[in-house]
């Protein structure tokens, strides 16, 4: 049941009033406004947009709106020395060159400052050598190459198709395999859905379209030169050699027309199986090198990008809480884009803008939320979540004491099929209850709830009659709040049908073709999916900021902890002999989970019964709920990943986008059969079980009666 217990309350100032104020037409208008020119991080255009948003949020009625600036390491192509890849003959002559940039979309021919496709933070270099095709460049792809096929990537240039995992993991894997350069490309198998035209006549990727993106392996560090601390005016900066997460080999992205020219000549080994074949008319030979007639030809990369310390600007808006102003509910999404940002991020930024407008309208009518709501327009997300991370580093002491929840608001859509939610288990019940109150925008579900269409289209694999809610991974601005600070976090957007569309993300992701027209013509002409996402994100923020008792259910954490413990135990049990030899036991973990379950159950009973009119007891119970997520934080962090401190969840070490449960144990067990010192390896497994068990038990105790 929605709450309406803020100060100056009148019957209309409740969740319904807030939701009714949200308008699809406004989101459409804001999206158009935000996408007419590029807003690359560190540019004047993006600074001007920051000031525009600051001004508009003030007009909408927020109490204060400030710019928070930082000087962080960014990366740009050299304007006079473009990046490209060549095929060179035995004389060193370039007989083929890849495109220098994408052909512009219709209507944008005269737009200046479109950054050409590049891999942000690639070092400079002009390596030349034989090509090896490495499929998606996942950990398992390199295992297949090196262990099964005995192909050595050392000193080779590897070509990998985008998709499946974060591009930074691909580059890291290539580096570890000894490659001297990486070419990333979009294969039509992953970025061209059958039966759909390419842009501008549909939402598929044209042959000249290219995905930009950063290739860092920051592991939550933020600005590579100031890990752990804000990149402010008096910051001490590391030298570039000590910077966190920078790639050591040149990397460059290309489209499938250019990839065709590189792959069609490949010789060497045939692909190991059909999963290594894309949709181009090429053999997908692994190499190394080109086939017979072309064996003397090599591939040469020409990369001249530069890393530069550049000023970025977050916009931080505040709507002060009437009752608990020292409790913060944060709604944040980024503003910087690679080019026009039609989907990423402006479909999210437009939704945030409308949510701010709606809250502002209520505030102008005398309403205030119970708790403070902070709104953020983050900068430099595309360069490694830099704006959000620097701000959180600067405000970490406040956030860890006052942070109730963080709701992320990047792209509102990646498809138009159904809802997709990733969040802490604490928010499961909030999401379920909210979506039951919202109308579904889906065709065939007129008059039905969002919960119903979502559950039908994306059912939970474990619980019948419930929708799938996924683990939080990373690759977006919630990372620092959840993985480092332990603030309950969630995200929601409309997505594609993953069963019928096997391509990775959406085809035009991070290309010049991600325009307003892409959204308006092909994804959401009525902006009804955007409106639904605004209702979900805004509704979550409203309820988190306004409900008397925080809408967190700790029993849902108990359920998933048991599931995760079972899962990690079954992984370990693939090695029964070693578990016996090294006396590996999960008893402590299962015991801690059992204790957590019992204590959470008792806490929930007390939560139903306590005197909500007693502000001290109310605050005490709410603090136990707020600090539960914090209790899963290990101040020492995960091994070699000090800024990933959540013991239950972390981004996968093999794919930043994916969440892994009990990551410390998982990583200790990963590929353990190949470790040179099994005794040491299983000792680390035991240590990680100990850390996990202790953390779960400690978290459980935060829910016990205080005295």
């Amino acid at each position: 049941k929605s709450s309406n217990e803020a100060t100056n309350i009148t019957p209309k100032h409740n969740m319904k009033a807030f939701l009714d104020e949200l308008k699809a037409e406004n989101i459409k208008k804001f999206l158009y406004n935000f996408t007419q020119i590029p807003h690359l991080a560190g540019t004047e255009q993006n600074f001007q947009l920051a000031k525009q948003i600051q001004s508009q949020w003030k007009e909408f009625g927020l109490d204060s709106v400030e710019l928070a600036h930082y000087d962080v390491l960014l990366s740009y192509p050299n304007k006079t020395h473009p990046n490209y890849i060549s095929i060179i003959n035995e004389d060193g002559n370039e007989i083929f060159n890849t495109s220098l940039f994408e052909p512009p979309p219709p209507g944008y021919e005269n737009v200046s400052d479109i950054v050409p496709p590049f891999s942000a933070f690639s070092p400079q270099g002009m390596p030349e050598g034989d090509l090896v095709y490495v499929n998606y460049a996942r950990t398992e792809d390199f295992f297949k190459l090196e262990r099964d096929m005995k192909i050595n990537c050392s000193g080779k240039i590897v070509i990998a198709r985008y998709g499946k995992v974060f591009r930074g993991n691909k580059v890291k894997n290539a580096q570890l395999a000894g490659a001297k350069g990486v070419i990333l490309y979009s294969d039509p198998a992953d970025y061209f859905a059958p039966g759909v035209k390419s842009y501008p006549d549909g939402w598929n990727l044209p042959g000249g379209g290219v995905q930009r993106g950063n290739i860092l392996n920051l592991n939550g560090a933020g600005d590579p030169l100031t890990p752990g601390y804000p990149a402010n005016e008096y910051a001490y900066r590391r030298g570039i050699a000590e910077a966190v997460g920078l790639p050591s080999i040149p990397v460059h992205p290309i489209g499938y027309y250019d990839a065709q020219k590189l792959l069609e000549k490949m010789g060497g080994s045939a692909p190991p199986d059909s999963s290594w074949r894309g949709s181009l008319k090429v053999p997908y030979n692994v190499g190394p090198g080109f086939t017979g007639n072309f064996s003397t030809q090599k591939v040469k990369m020409h990369i001249h990008s530069t890393n530069e310390v550049t000023r970025i600007y977050n916009v931080i808006g505040t709507l002060r809480g009437a009752v608990e102003p020292d409790r913060y509910v944060i709604l944040g999404g980024h503003r910087d884009s690679w080019v026009f940002g039609g989907i990423d991020p402006q479909s999210g930024a437009a939704v945030v803008h409308e949510i701010v407008r709606s809250f502002g309208t209520l505030k102008k009518e005398g309403w205030r939320p119970r708790r403070t709501i902070l709104f953020a327009s983050w900068d430099a997300e595309e360069f490694g979540l830099l704006g959000s991370t620097e701000w959180a580093e600067e405000n970490s002491r406040l956030l860890q004491e006052r942070g109730v929840a963080y709701i992320n608001a990047d792209s509102s859509i990646e498809g138009n099929y159904t809802l997709r939610v990733d969040c802490t288990p604490l928010m499961y019940s909030l999401v379920h209850n909210l979506t039951k109150e919202l109308k579904s925008p889906d065709e065939g579900f007129e008059g039905k709830s969002l919960y119903e269409s979502w559950t039908k289209k994306s059912p939970s694999p474990e619980f019948s009659g419930m929708p799938r809610i996924s683990k939080l991974g990373s690759g977006n601005d919630f990372e620092v709040f959840f993985q480092r600070l332990g603030i309950a976090s969630g995200r929601a957007r409309y997505t594609k049908n993953w069963e019928t569309n096997k391509f990775s993300g959406y085809p035009l992701y991070h290309s010049v073709y991600e325009t307003y027209e892409l959204v308006e013509k092909f994804y959401d002409p009525m902006f009804k999916y955007h409106l639904t996402v605004a209702q979900v994100r805004g509704g979550m923020v409203f309820e988190l900021a306004n409900s008397i008792v925080l809408p967190f259910d700790c029993r849902d954490y108990a359920v998933v902890l048991r599931k995760y413990a079972d899962k990690i135990y079954s992984i370990s049990m693939k090695h029964p002999q070693e578990m016996k030899t090294y006396s590996v036991s999960f008893d402590s973990l299962f015991s801690a989970v059992k204790n957590f379950t019992e204590i959470a159950s008792k806490f929930s009973e007390r939560l139903q019964d306590f005197d909500k009119s007693n502000p001290i007891v109310l605050r005490m119970m709410n603090d136990q709920l707020m600090f539960l997520e914090r209790a899963f934080i290990d101040p020492l962090g995960l091994p070699d990943r000090p800024f990933y401190r959540h013991v239950i969840y972390a981004p996968s070490s093999h794919n930043k986008y994916a969440g892994e449960s009990f990551p410390g144990i998982y990583d200790a067990l990963f590929d353990i059969e190949s470790k040179v010192d099994p005794s040491k390896a299983w000792g680390e497994v035991k240590r990680q079980i100990y850390v996990a068990a202790f953390t779960v038990q400690a978290a459980a105790e935060t829910l016990s009666e205080v005295a």
């Epitope: 495109s99 220098l100 021919e109 390419s198 501008p200 006549d201 044209p206």
Partner: antibody, heavy 119, light 106 residues
Framework: EVQLVESGGGLVQPGGSLRLSCAAS????????MAWVRQAPGKGLEWVAN????????FYADSLKGRFTISRDNSKNTLYLQMNSLRAEDTAVYYC????????????WGQGTTVTVSS | DIQLTQSPSSLSASVGDRVTITCRAS?????MYWYQQKPGKAPKPWIY???NLASGVPSRFSGSGSGTDYTLTISSMQPEDFATYYC?????????FGQGTKLEIK
């Protein structure tokens, strides 16, 4: 075999109108963009207009906007160019061509039809 | 609009000569396309996406370039190569052609 056959050319007075047609065969017409290109006597090639698969998007040379209209009838596998307010400088051979998509070149051309604008 | 300037406008060559035609764009384009036209005939696609030979085009033809400067090269002129060659950009609309280069027998 892909075939494009233009028709409708002829002699017309300045200020007059003409409608060119291009009959397509040997391929799925609705799967391709189509274009018109012209060539004045003794001169080079000049792009006139093109049209997307279903006719919902059209593109024109700036100098011809408002006078020329490109259209298509996918049920008849035919491309059209309606030319109004014709001028002497519109005298040319008009070729129709096929494009895979917006960013792709004309991979097949017709043999052309001659338009002469003269009093 | 992107202007394309071909040079030379005309060229006299002998059979066996190596011939290079250049096409300069007024601003950068991602690729260049080339057509061959013989008198009284429709143009034929000759080179696509800068360096790819169209079906049936002899291997003595090659294309190269990037940014604003592109070339079509004939390594050894043959009698059937005497024709007019046009460059065209499909990078951005309006689509534009070069003014043509006429190859004549010396």
């Amino acid at each position: 075999e892909v075939q494009l056959v233009e028709s409708g050319g002829g002699l017309v007075q300045p200020g007059g109108s003409l409608r060119l047609s291009c009959a397509a065969s040997g391929f799925t017409f609705s799967d391709y963009y189509m274009a018109w290109v012209r060539q004045a006597p003794g001169k080079g090639l000049e792009w006139v207009a093109n049209i997307n698969y279903d006719g919902s998007s059209t593109f024109y040379a700036d100098s011809l906007k408002g006078r020329f209209t490109i259209s298509r009838d996918n049920s008849k596998n035919t491309l059209y160019l309606q030319m109004n307010s014709l001028r002497a400088e519109d005298t040319a051979v008009y070729y129709c061509g096929r494009q895979v998509g917006y960013y792709d070149p004309m991979d097949y051309w017709g043999q052309g039809t001659t338009v002469t604008v003269s009093s | 609009d992107i202007q394309l300037t071909q040079s030379p406008s005309s060229l006299s060559a002998s059979v066996g000569d190596r011939v290079t035609i250049t096409c300069r764009a007024s601003s950068s384009v991602s690729h260049m396309y080339w057509y061959q036209q013989k008198p009284g005939k429709a143009p034929k696609p000759w080179i696509y996406r800068t360096s790819n030979l169209a079906s049936g085009v002899p291997s003595r033809f090659s294309g190269s370039g990037s940014g604003t400067d592109y070339t079509l090269t004939i390594s050894s002129m043959q009698p059937e190569d005497f024709a007019t060659y046009y460059c065209q950009q499909y990078h951005s609309y309006p689509l534009t052609f070069g003014q043509g280069t006429k190859l004549e027998i010396k």
